[in-house]
């Protein structure tokens, strides 16, 4: 139960995601350099 967040400021979260969208950054990545929306949505969008 964490309070609602102010979505007004832009920036990456701690998974490199920008405000709910996927990120594209190739530096230092060994597994995947471009992430689809599914990579960042986990079960919420896929309905799993």
């Amino acid at each position: 139960t964490i309070q609602g967040t102010n979505r007004s400021s832009k920036g990456r979260s701690l998974i490199g995601k920008v405000d709910g969208t996927s990120h594209v950054t190739g530096k230092g990545v060994t597994v995947e350099t471009v992430f689809s929306v599914d990579e960042f949505s986990a079960s919420v969008l896929t309905g799993k």
Epitope: K17, G28, V31, D38, A42
Partner: antibody, heavy 122, light 111 residues
Framework: QVQLVQSGAEVKKPGASVKVSCKAS????????FHWVRQAPGQGLEWVGW????????HFAQKFQGRVTMTRDTSISTAYMELSRLRSDDTAVYYC???????????????WGQGTTVTVSS | QSVLTQPPSASGTPGQRVTISCSGS????????VYWYQQLPGTAPKIFIY???QRPSGVPDRFSGSKSGTSASLAISGLRSEDEADYYC???????????FGGGTKLTVLG
């Protein structure tokens, strides 16, 4: 309640590998990323990498690439981190942490495991 | 040496206001969200501020976060003995493509 429970302490010899587990409960396991963070004795926090438990996608700190593997078993809601070619300076407490961000939210690393002490000594 | 610079220590007496700084660069704090963690001795870290200035429920409103340019700060007003802990800032770094933590600040409550 949301909880992460990690495996017990490990003592390893240099050159060996260690695999630490992190069992999640109280929420949908595949819904949130896991970070792994370590803390050497008396030192600060150091990020190792993350895994998306839904897809298995991983992303590691440059320092650990080639030595770290992150996996998950969705059937038992457990994430794993394996570190190979251990050195004495890998001695640390290793934490798993759930990332509270998802499609329309972002709370940072909002739930942490209790930590697993890994000692590397000959 | 950490990518994010924090003072190693800070102190104050009960009731005082203390500020802990976290200095970064244009590839981390300058463009991304800052998070603050409290770590009590012998325990796992706990989220105290997320998205620069947002407080999780359960964290007293004596704690506040702010960000300006390439620096961030955590302010604690009405200091209490239970605030004595290590505090870490964290942020995603676009150049390193990963999370970076500050070196941590040990807060001591005097008296």
């Amino acid at each position: 309640q949301v909880q992460l429970v990690q495996s017990g302490a490990e003592v390893k010899k240099p050159g060996a590998s260690v695999k630490v587990s992190c069992k999640a409960s109280g929420y949908t396991f595949t819904g949130y990323f896991f970070h792994w963070v370590r803390q050497a004795p008396g030192q600060g926090l150091e990020w190792v990498g993350w895994i998306n438990p839904n897809s298995g996608a991983t992303h590691f700190a440059q320092k650990f690439q080639g030595r770290v593997t992150m996996t998950r078993d969705t059937s038992i809601s457990t994430a794993y981190m394996e570190l190979s070619r251990l050195r004495s300076d890998d001695t640390a407490v290793y934490y798993c942490a759930r990332d509270g961000s998802n499609w329309n939210r972002d709370y940072g690393m909002d739930v942490w495991g209790q930590g697993t002490t890994v000692t590397v000594s000959s | 040496q950490s990518v994010l610079t924090q003072p190693p220590s800070a102190s104050g007496t009960p009731g005082q206001r203390v500020t802990i700084s976290c200095s970064g660069s244009s590839s981390n704090i300058g463009i991304n969200h800052v998070y603050w963690y409290q770590q009590l001795p012998g325990t796992a870290p706990k989220i105290f501020i997320y998205r620069n200035n947002q407080r999780p429920s359960g964290v007293p409103d004596r704690f506040s976060g702010s960000k300006s340019g390439t620096s961030a700060s955590l302010a604690i007003s009405g200091l209490r003995s239970e605030d004595e802990a290590d505090y870490y800032c964290a942020v995603w770094d676009d150049s390193l493509s990963g999370v970076v933590f500050g070196g941590g600040t040990k807060l001591t409550v005097l008296g």
